[in-house]
Interface confidence: medium
């Protein structure tokens, strides 16, 4: 419906406080070099606009679009140019080409200094002090290194961050209070700006239709008693919800999330049985509350798929009549029956499903070409079992961290062009999956695993994308969103890679690694195992392990002795050169 | 608004046939999700037959498989439900109902259809 002002109705349904928030979250994921006072000046300006058009909604401008009124205040920034070079052309533009310009300018991986946690009575003292900047200081932060944060559900981190400074800052310990709190927020925050950094991926570079498949079968395996039409309006509903998100409107997007929840829960009954709790809470928790709800039971005597979809001799018309519908009830019907199949594999099924109708109704005998089409399913089912089946047993023999390094070494050995930094990131994420997925029980394992892998390799992706250096990465990144991991696991040793030359200055270490934390030195050494397969790429699992073996133990025997730096030194040409003669670089 | 009326009920025999119309006004029918509800003397309202909006892709009750047809003319705006091989138990209020905004889909569930027909009585009986 149209509202004479937009910012008005915004302002009006979301609350002065929400609306601020989001505003911030905006322009901080649009201009992430900006000081923190600058965005909170800009913040100010629009929020006092905002509040004089829900005054007078016919008041000066008050009618102009949101892109216009924000893109109109981010160009006002003086210094633009100097700051962000070519995104200042951006302003030359007209809406909606100039928003479309600063979302193609967001920055996965902006230049900013890694976010140190200062003591805790300092931050007690800060929050204290003014707890508005402090939490404003919060969103600022995570929305700048993180631009595509969901930003309804940063709303809901930042009352969670809220809550535990409330709490600790009184405690006897306020740090053994508020630093497990703090942790779990920041690798909670970590997996959820991947895990929309997928779905925006799913809707820029693949499309609506690909992210409603995904929604399709994700809702169908949490909802299985919900029929398909309830299914099919919460997934336009969901679409709609991360396509503004996504696109920066941030404002809308929360609205609309909000109306989602409303309805979901107003609707319980026709949708799921495990939503009663959620729907008790108050309105972030409850949004948060339903996008992770468990799935529901599945209704019992669900009759076989293969009647409407092998077997019927309507299966050629209702495909022709309306092929996206008649896939869509396919996913639904499949996805229901499978909340132990990862959501990838059940689009892999309808995609297989699909390309087998598309040949056989144009066929002279469409049934008995499509009627052996479930045949097809059981490679590509065995296929991830399998994957996961191994990959667990190697991490119940390895322990996380030797985990992360088998991987390091497997993936720096399949794309060795990829920046080190990038793969030590990857590999480490990809490594948690163990920890992460595999005590679960055989039904939950797969879609923990799988799903989890395709949230980590579009990490990778979007990574490379903002500086391509391998051929392999763009292939898997771009051909089939679904096939990804497949895609990656096929990859081999890259027989074309020219070894790095060998740089003594990369495994020169100092003192400074005993002070580090054992996360930090981890990284460290994980680091040096990347740099040595670039080196060696044809070194054996055994070559690297002796390697790191007496990395480890140069480590630690320089991080007991009196004089640290001589040590390392010392110790540290003796381990090149052994390295370089056990490799025989 | 979509505004729906029946028609066609009456007494008919067990074995025999009738054939419910339902004219709609305020929206093109063929943009709409329609269905066919009805509900006999003490119990709730039932999911008859639904066809889907802009598509012709048909949903039954499996109590009425093989027996009633839905089916709709969009040059007259017009929904219709052909019921052979009646039976005494198909006795009930007849309605139809409509779901504009999500073409393509029809639901068995009646309370996710915002517009509904006053309804026509079709009793079957000796």
């Known amino acids: 419906d149209a509202h004479k002002s937009e910012v008005a109705h915004r302002f009006k349904d979301l609350g002065e406080e929400n609306f601020k928030a989001l505003v911030l979250i905006a322009f901080a994921q649009y201009l992430q070099q900006c000081p923190f006072e600058d965005h909170v000046k800009l913040v100010n300006e629009v929020t006092e606009f905002a509040k004089t058009c829900v005054a007078d909604e016919s008041a000066e401008n008050c009618d102009k679009s949101l892109h216009t009124l924000f893109g109109d205040k981010l160009c006002t920034v003086a210094t633009l140019r100097e700051t962000y070079g070519e995104m200042a052309d951006c302003c030359a533009k007209q809406e909606p080409e100039r928003n479309e310009c600063f979302l193609q300018h967001k920055d996965d991986n902006p230049n900013l200094p890694r976010l140190v946690r200062p003591e805790v009575d300092v931050m007690c003292t800060a929050f204290h002090d003014n707890e508005e900047t402090f939490l404003k200081k919060y969103l600022y932060e995570i929305a700048r290194r993180h631009p595509y944060f969901y930003a309804p559900e940063l709303l809901f981190f930042a009352k969670r961050y809220k809550a535990a400074f409330t709490e600790c800052c009184q405690a006897a310990d306020k740090a053994a209070c508020l630093l497990p709190k703090l942790d779990e927020l920041r690798d909670e925050g970590k997996a959820s700006s991947a895990k929309q950094r997928l779905k925006c991926a799913s809707l820029q570079k693949f499309g609506e239709r690909a992210f409603k498949a995904w929604a399709v079968a994700r809702l169908s395996q949490r909802f299985p008693k919900a029929e398909f039409a309830e299914v099919s309006k919460l997934v336009t509903d969901l679409t709609k919800v991360h396509t503004e998100c996504c696109h920066g409107d941030l404002l809308e997007c929360a609205d609309d999330r909000a109306d989602l929840a409303k309805y979901i829960c107003e609707n319980q009954d026709s949708i799921s049985s495990k939503l009663k709790e959620c729907c008790e809470k108050p309105l972030l928790e409850k949004s948060h509350c339903i996008a992770e709800v468990e799935n529901d039971e599945m209704p019992a005597d669900l009759p076989s798929l293969a009647a409407d979809f092998v077997e019927s001799k309507d299966v050629c018309k209702n495909y022709a009549e309306a092929k996206d519908v008649f896939l869509g009830m396919f996913l639904y019907e499949y996805a229901r029956r499978h909340p132990d199949y990862s959501v990838v594999l059940l689009l892999r099924l309808a995609k297989t499903y699909e390309t087998t109708l598309e040949k056989c109704c144009a066929a002279a005998d469409p049934h008995e070409c499509y009627a052996k089409v479930f045949d097809e399913f059981k490679p590509l089912v065995e296929e991830p079992q399998n994957l996961i089946k191994q990959n667990c047993e190697l991490f119940e023999q390895l322990g996380e961290y030797k985990f992360q390094n088998a991987l390091l070494v497997r993936y720096t050995k399949k794309v060795p062009q990829v920046s080190t930094p990038t793969l030590v990131e990857v590999s480490r994420n990809l490594g948690k999956v163990g920890s992460k997925c595999c005590k679960h029980p055989e039904a939950k394992r797969m879609p923990c695993a799988e799903d989890y892998l395709s949230v980590v390799l579009n990490q990778l992706c979007v990574l490379h994308e903002k500086t391509p250096v391998s051929d392999r990465v763009t292939k898997c990144c771009t051909e089939s969103l679904v096939n990804r991991r497949p895609c990656f696991s096929a990859l081999e040793v890259d027989e074309t890679y020219v070894p790095k030359e060998f740089n003594a200055e990369t495994f020169t270490f100092h003192a400074d690694i005993c002070t580090l934390s054992e996360k930090e030195r981890q990284i460290k050494k994980q680091t040096a195992l990347v740099e040595l397969v670039k080196h060696k790429p044809k070194a054996t699992k055994e070559q690297l392990k002796a390697v790191m073996d007496d990395f480890a133990a140069f480590v630690e025997k320089c991080c007991k002795a009196d004089d640290k730096e001589t040590c390392f030194a010392e110790e540290g040409k003796k381990l090149v050169a052994a390295s370089q003669a056990a490799l025989g670089l | 608004e979509v505004q729906l009326l029946e028609s066609g009920g009456g007494l008919v025999q067990p074995g025999g046939s009738l054939r419910l119309s339902c004219a709609a006004s305020?929206?093109?029918?063929?943009?709409?999700?329609v269905a066919w509800f009805r509900q006999a003397p003490g119990k709730g309202r039932e999911f008859v037959a639904g066809?889907?909006?802009?598509?012709?892709?048909?949903y039954y009750a499996d109590s009425v498989k093989g027996r009633f047809t839905i089916s709709r003319d969009n040059s007259k705006n017009t929904l219709y439900l052909q019921m052979n091989s009646l039976r005494p138990e198909d006795t009930a209020v007849y309605y139809c109902?409509?779901?504009?905004?999500?073409?393509?889909?029809?639901?068995?569930?009646?309370?996710?259809?915002?517009?509904w027909g006053q309804g026509t009585l079709v009793t079957v009986s000796s």
């Open positions: 109902a409509a779901r504009p905004g999500r073409p393509l889909i029809t639901s068995k569930q009646a309370s996710l259809y915002p517009y």
């Open positions: 305020g929206r093109y029918i063929d943009e709409t999700a």
């Open positions: 066809i889907g909006g802009g598509v012709d892709i048909t």
